[in-house]
C-alpha cells in the first residue's frame, strides 16, 4: 500500500508568492511559492495519486504583514481552502498568546491541529478542550493512518503560551499515544511536529511504532540529487534514521516559507511496516501556475494590507537616525530603538531566579536602511519601518559562548571606517573599542547585562559562559562576515518578523524618544 505525504513547514505567513530568497516578490516571472501556486501542485498530485495526505508541521504564524493584520485568520482561511489534512502546532502559533491561537485558528480550522506534548491546566483546560488533539486517525484510501503531533518544549522561551500550558518532553509524551494507536490496530503512524531536525531524528530513533517523521522548526532542507535552487541540503531526502528497535525510519522537512512542497512516497506492507520511501521537495517556481481562484481570493484579502501600511503605529518626538553615516560608524539611536524592541519582544519571566531569559541584542548596522524624520508630525507607519528594515528578516534567539561574542565584536570593527555593514548596534551590552590597536584586538571592554539577578547590572563578559542573544537571522546565518556566529552557535531558534517586532514595540510605547547613551564607546 502506497501513501503520498505532501508537507510544508515554517511557512511564516508567505501567503503571496515571494522572490527566491523568500522576501517580497519583485519580478513576478521569477517568483516562487505562495498558496495559489501550492494549491495548483497539490491538486495536480491529488488527481494523479490515490492516497495523499497534505500536512503542515507548524509555524504558519508570523513573518509578514499578512500575520500582523489578520492575526491567524488568514492561516485558517487559506489552509481550509487548500484542504490540509492536519497541522502540528509550532512555537510561533503562540505569538499572540493562547487566545490568539484559539479564536482565529483552532476554532476556524477545518482540519485537525495536533500536539501530544502540550497539556492544558487550570481554567484553560476546559476552554481549550478538543480544540487541538494529541493525534488524529485519518481514513486514507482503504487504510487508516495515525498522525501524532508534537511541539518544541522550548516554546515558553520562544513565544507567549502563558502559564496554563505545560510543554512536556516530546519523546515521553509521544510514546503512550503511539502505543495506544497500536493497540487500536492503527499500524501506520506519522509523527508530525515542530521541534527541529535533531529532535525529529531522536523521535525516529526512540519512539517505538513511529513509521515516518515529518518535521519543522529548523528550516532544514533535505534533497537527493542536484538541488534546484540556492538552498544547500543538510542531507538526503528522506533522511533515514535507524530506530533503536532496528527499523529504517524516514525523516523529512521542507525548508521553509512555502518555497518547496515536500513530496514523500512511502510503501507499507500489510502489517504497516515501511518497505520503501523516496521523494524530494518540489520547488514551487514560476513554471507552476498560480491557481486563479485562490489568487483572486488572495487579491481580495490583500486590500486590507495596503490600508494598514499607511496607518499610524505610534509617534517619535526625536529624529530616528538610521543613516549609514551614523549606524555604520557609531552608536545610533535607531539601532538602540530596534535592539530595545528586540529585547522587549523576548520578555519571558519563566524562572524566579532570572528577571528575563535574555538581555542582549546585537544588530548589524548595515541592516538599518533608512532614518525616520520626526518632523512629519512624529508619525511612524508600517511603511516607514519597511524602509528601515526592508529585507523581511527575523529577530532570532541564539545561544553563544562569550568567546564567540568577543570574536563578533572584534569583527564589528576589524575594518572600521569604510562604511561597512558589520558594525554592530547593541542592547544590554556596553562595548569599548580602541581603534589604535590592530584588527582582532580592538575590544578593550565588553560588559553584558546580567539575567540571573533581581537588579540588572553590567558585568564583564566571561569567555566560557553560554549567553542568550537576540540578533537578526542574517547574522545567525553568518551574514556580513560573521562566520564565527554561524559556526559556533550552540542553539538557534527562529524569531518574529523584524518589522513586526519594532512596530509592536512602538504601538506599545505610543511615543518614543530613543537616545544615544554610551552603549558603544571609543577609547
Amino acid at each position: 500500500w502506497e501513501l503520498t505525504i505532501l508537507h510544508t513547514n515554517d511557512v511564516h505567513s508567505r501567503l503571496e508568492q515571494t522572490s527566491e530568497d523568500s522576501s517580497k516578490c519583485v519580478n513576478a516571472s521569477r517568483c516562487m511559492g505562495g498558496v495559489a501556486r501550492l494549491f495548483t501542485k497539490v491538486q495536480q498530485i491529488r488527481r494523479a495519486e490515490p492516497n495523499v495526505l497534505l500536512l503542515d508541521a507548524g509555524d504558519q504564524y508570523q513573518g509578514t504583514i499578512w500575520f500582523t493584520v489578520y492575526k491567524g485568520a488568514e492561516v485558517a482561511h487559506f489552509m481550509n481552502a487548500l484542504r490540509y489534512d492536519a497541522m502540528a502546532l509550532g512555537n510561533h502559533e503562540f505569538d499572540n498568546g493562547v487566545e490568539g491561537l484559539i479564536e482565529p485558528l483552532l476554532k476556524e480550522a477545518k482540519f485537525p491541529i495536533l500536539s501530544a506534548n502540550i497539556k492544558a491546566k487550570g481554567p484553560l483546560a476546559s476552554q481549550i478542550s478538543g480544540l487541538y488533539l494529541p493525534y488524529k486517525v485519518l481514513p486514507v484510501g482503504d487504510e487508516v493512518v495515525g498522525i501524532v503531533g508534537y511541539t518544541s518544549k522550548e516554546t515558553p522561551f520562544l513565544s507567549n503560551p502563558g502559564t496554563n500550558l505545560v510543554f512536556e518532553d516530546e519523546i515521553t509524551a509521544l510514546q503512550p499515544e503511539v502505543d495506544k494507536l497500536k493497540t487500536l490496530n492503527v499500524n501506520k503512524i506519522i509523527a508530525l511536529g515542530h521541534s527541529g531536525f535533531e529532535m525529529d531524528k531522536l523521535i525516529a530513533q526512540k519512539v517505538r511504532g513511529v513509521d515516518v517523521v515529518v518535521g519543522g522548526h529548523s528550516n532544514t532542507f533535505l534533497y537527493t540529487g542536484n538541488p534546484p535552487s540556492k538552498e544547500v541540503p543538510a542531507g538526503k531526502y528522506p533522511f533515514i534514521v535507524t530506530s533503536d528497535d532496528g527499523r529504517k525510519v524516514p525523516v523529512v522537512q521542507a525548508y521553509a516559507f512555502g518555497k518547496y512542497l515536500g513530496y514523500l512516497k512511502i510503501e507499507f506492507d500489510e502489517r504497516g511496516n515501511v518497505i520503501s520511501s523516496h521523494g524530494n521537495p518540489i520547488l514551487l517556481n514560476s513554471s507552476i501556475p498560480e491557481d486563479p481562484s485562490i489568487k483572486a481570493d488572495i487579491n481580495k484579502w490583500r486590500i486590507k494590507l495596503d490600508n494598514y501600511s499607511t496607518q499610524e503605529l505610534g509617534k517619535t518626538i526625536v529624529y530616528l537616525d538610521g543613516s549609514s553615516q551614523s549606524c555604520r560608524f557609531r552608536e545610533c539611536n535607531m539601532g538602540n530603538l530596534i535592539c530595545d524592541a528586540m529585547i522587549n519582544n523576548n520578555l519571558r519571566h519563566t524562572d524566579e531566579m532570572f528577571w528575563n531569559h535574555v538581555s542582549m541584542c546585537i544588530l548589524n548596522g548595515g541592516g538599518i536602511r533608512s532614518p525616520i524624520d520626526e518632523r512629519n508630525n512624529g508619525t511612524i507607519t508600517w511603511e516607514n519601518l519597511a524602509a528601515v528594515l526592508p529585507f523581511g528578516g527575523t529577530f532570532d534567539l541564539v545561544q553563544l559562548k562569550g568567546s564567540t561574542l568577543k570574536k563578533a565584536f572584534e569583527h564589528s570593527v576589524h575594518r572600521y571606517g569604510q562604511s561597512t555593514g558589520e558594525f554592530l548596534q547593541v542592547g544590554g551590552i556596553h562595548v569599548v573599542y580602541d581603534l589604535s590597536r590592530k584588527p582582532g584586538d580592538r575590544v578593550v571592554k565588553l560588559d553584558v547585562l546580567c539575567t540571573k539577578c533581581r537588579v540588572p547590572s553590567y558585568d564583564p563578559l566571561k569567555m566560557d559562559e553560554v549567553y542568550k542573544v537576540i540578533l537578526p537571522n542574517f547574522l545567525a546565518n553568518g551574514g556580513d562576515g560573521f562566520q564565527m556566529i554561524k559556526d559556533e552557535l550552540l542553539r538557534h531558534d527562529s524569531g518574529d518578523q523584524d518589522i513586526n517586532v519594532v512596530s509592536t514595540y512602538i504601538s506599545k510605547m505610543k511615543v518614543i524618544y530613543p537616545a544615544v547613551e554610551g552603549r558603544i564607546k571609543f577609547s
Epitope: 490515490p50 478542550s129 478538543g130 493525534y135 481514513p139 484510501g141 487504510e143 487508516v144 487500536l184
Partner: antibody, heavy 118, light 107 residues
C-alpha cells in the same frame, strides 16, 4: 441546503442482494466522506463503514466485511451500499450520513428500510 | 473496539428542566465524540461533534462537554420538541461505536 436522499423500502428474499442509493446534493460531493449506519428495530445504531468519494477508498467495520460493499458514482453524486447473501439478521433501516472535515457525521439520509423475508 | 456506555438508558423530565445525559468510553477518545437526537420513525439528527461543537442550526440550549473518557450532553431548558432518543458516538478510531441510547420522555 445539504441533503442525502435515499430510496424507498425494500422487501427482499433471503440469499438475495440489494443495492441502496444515497444521492447527495447541496455541497461538493467529493469534499466529504460518506458513512453508512445500520439500525435494527428498537435497537441502537451500528457503524458499517466509510467511503471516500474522491478515490472510492473504503474502511469497513470488521463485522460487516463480506456482507457489505460501498461504492460511489461521482457523475451522479450518489453513494451506494450493496448488501448480499441477505438473512433475517439484515432486516433493518440503513442510513447514509455525510461526514464533515473532522470525519464526524453531520447530515443524514432519511433511511432505507430493508426487510428480508421469504 | 471501544465501548460506549450511555446513562441513563431512559429518563423523565419536565419542560424547562435542565437535563444531562452522560456517555463513558472504555478508554480516552480524545474529544472525538458526537451526540445525535432521534425521533420515532425519523433519521438521527447531529447535534454536536468534537465533544462540544454545535452543528449549525442546532438550538443553543444544547451543549456538550467532557474530555478523556467522560462526556455529557446538556439541555439547559427542556422543550417539548426535545423528546426522543439521544445517542453518543466515538469517532476517535475505527470502527466508530455508538452508545446504547438514552430515551428522554416528558414527566
Amino acid at each position: 441546503q445539504v441533503q442525502m436522499k435515499q430510496s424507498g423500502p425494500e422487501l427482499v428474499k433471503p440469499g438475495a442482494s440489494v443495492k441502496i442509493p444515497c444521492k447527495a446534493s447541496g455541497y461538493t460531493f467529493t469534499d466529504c466522506n460518506m458513512d453508512w449506519v445500520k439500525q435494527s428495530h428498537g435497537e441502537s445504531l451500528e457503524w458499517i463503514g466509510d467511503i471516500n468519494p474522491n478515490n472510492g477508498g473504503t474502511i469497513y467495520n470488521q463485522k460487516f466485511k463480506g456482507k457489505v460493499t460501498l461504492t460511489i458514482d461521482k457523475s451522479s453524486s450518489t453513494a451506494y451500499m450493496e448488501l448480499r447473501s441477505l438473512t433475517s439478521e439484515d432486516t433493518a433501516v440503513y442510513y447514509c450520513a455525510r461526514t464533515n472535515w473532522d470525519y464526524a457525521m453531520d447530515y443524514w439520509g432519511q433511511g432505507t428500510s430493508v426487510t428480508v423475508s421469504s | 473496539d471501544i465501548q460506549m456506555t450511555q446513562s441513563p438508558s431512559s429518563m423523565y423530565a419536565s419542560l424547562g428542566e435542565r437535563v444531562t445525559i452522560t456517555c463513558k468510553a472504555s478508554q480516552d477518545i480524545n474529544s472525538q465524540l458526537s451526540w445525535f437526537q432521534q425521533k420515532p420513525g425519523k433519521s438521527p439528527k447531529t447535534l454536536i461533534y468534537r465533544a462540544n461543537r454545535l452543528i449549525d442550526g442546532v438550538p443553543s440550549r444544547f451543549s456538550g462537554s467532557g474530555s478523556g473518557q467522560d462526556y455529557s450532553l446538556t439541555i439547559s431548558s427542556l422543550e417539548y420538541e426535545d423528546m426522543g432518543i439521544y445517542y453518543c458516538l466515538q469517532y476517535d478510531v475505527f470502527p466508530r461505536t455508538f452508545g446504547g441510547g438514552t430515551k428522554l420522555e416528558l414527566k
